[in-house]
Interface confidence: low
Amino acid sequence: GITNINCSGHIWVEPATIFKMGMNISIYCQAAIKNCQPRKLHFYKNGIKERFQITRINKTTARLWYKNFLEPHASMYCTAECPKHFQETLICGKDISSGYPPDIPDEVTCVIYEYSGNMTCTWNAGKLTYIDTKYVVHVKSLETEEEQQYLTSSYINISTDSLQGGKKYLVWVQAANALGMEESKQLQIHLDDIVIPSAAVISRAETINATVPKTIIYWDSQTTIEKVSCEMRYKATTNQTWNVKEFDTNFTYVQQSEFYLEPNIKYVFQVRCQETGKRYWQPWSSLFFHKTPETVPQVTSKAFQHDTWNSGLTVASISTGHLTSDNRGDIG
């Protein structure tokens, strides 16, 4: 950066090189150039010469004043006009930063995604600080009182191999930057309670012709957890409101869920699961679309949105298409 240049003098910032956004700051430049009594001292911000708020303090020093400085980063340097020198002479440079102290981290959450081998801890960091902010995640065993600390700049994956101090832990997060430090509340966890089963995926749908046509949704998960509770939500794509069906699930075989739906309507389905009785859910699965056939005895087979016509089948419509991925499920 600008701070690596060879200096013929000194540049400094008051109150500090990193300061709170919106503060008034002063940048001082002091020349120490051999055989030069500077006629003039110039300041540059990001390569552009500053014209205002410059005060000459003495023969070798000048001050640049900024009111309500709002830029997160800026590169400053100053130069001198020396007699008998055609060009300005570089004195020194400095990178400056403005930002905010961290907020208190909240919503600390730790989960173990099945098969990951890690405990993943996340939190709400609060407002953007604009400056380098580090987080220390503290994990303390409630059984052995052993404490581990992990330094990160966002979330943290902690190997479950490292959690040898029993199953109960306290987790809290400290946020720190040049402008301050804050600490979250402590979260108490039990390792058995924070496992999220591996993702449930809807693989296909079919509508079967009967007196009352019925749609079967096929869905599956790689989970080895025995007691899993799942929710499937569905709605017509034109609707705002979801219908939700709940299931107690055994994933030793592909799940088949039956729905009695209106004919000739495009529906969207999503599924999510949790270990029964536990706190954390999977995110909603990818959006899965299925259009029910018309009630007339024409028969359509639909797969990945390509239509083909058949006759004499009992299956009226098949879909195996995920058109988009949206783990938040904010649609409609």
């Epitope: 591996s198 080895t224 991925s325």
Partner: antibody, heavy 121, light 107 residues
């Protein structure tokens, strides 16, 4: 380390059946779905589908429904791709590839070395 | 199906040069994209997943980024072993789909 080792090259007559194997090692086989990918000579990659290695449930892409079958031999940590009634357009290199990243899908992260299957005239 | 439009189809570049490849998704894929490298001997390796996360063991000269529906793979300074075919793969929606590929050749 994680490895997917596929069976050797095959030369097949039209109408014959070919079965390619993919032996996994270095991880728990039933924890990850297995994908199959086709690459015709001089062409790009085409996803054929995947098999759930825990339940054995296969999912096929449209172009691979009918003559193609995915299967498993869990005790041997091996996945299979069978092509029935082999056709000229099936001449290609076939890759097995391990899925990853539950509950967030991160696609495919480990690949077999590929098995070349050629039609003999 | 989600179409992945990959460009350019081929690219000649010199050692040490910086190059970028792009894939455009025809539908929203929410960052569910990886970049793959296929060497001349046919072996395939994943470089990037989740649009911008570098796989372990992959040199830091490779990076991935996203701008809307455009996804890019950048190699900051080409080395001899980087001359290969590159593919993007979207895994947001079934069927998973690949870009048509970019052949990166030595100039």
């Amino acid at each position: 380390q994680i490895q997917l080792v596929q069976s050797g090259p095959e030369l097949k007559k039209p109408g014959e059946t070919v079965k390619i194997s993919c032996k996994a090692s270095g991880y728990t086989f039933t924890n990850y779905g297995m994908n199959w990918v086709k690459q015709a000579p001089g062409k790009g990659l085409k996803w054929m589908g995947w098999i759930n290695t825990y339940t054995g449930a296969p999912t096929y892409a449209d172009d691979f429904k009918g003559r193609f079958a995915f299967s498993l031999e869990t005790s041997a940590s091996t996945a299979y791709l069978q092509i029935n009634n082999f056709k000229n357009e099936d001449t290609a290199t076939y890759f097995c590839a391990r899925g990853n990243g539950y509950p967030y899908y991160y696609g495919i992260n480990y690949w077999g070395q590929g098995t070349s299957v050629t039609v003999s005239s | 199906d989600v179409q992945m439009i990959q460009s350019p189809s081929s690219l000649s570049a010199s050692l040490g040069e910086r190059v970028s490849l792009t894939c455009r998704a025809s539908q929203e894929i929410s960052g569910n994209l990886s970049w793959l490298q296929q060497k001349p001997d046919g072996t395939i390796k994943r470089l990037i997943y989740a649009a911008s996360t570098l796989d372990s063991g992959v040199p830091k000269r490779f990076s991935g980024s996203r701008s809307g529906s455009d996804y890019s793979l950048t190699i900051s300074s080409l080395e001899s072993e980087d001359f290969a075919d590159y593919y993007c793969l979207q895994y947001a929606s079934y069927p998973w789909t690949f870009g048509a590929g970019t052949r990166l050749e030595i100039k």
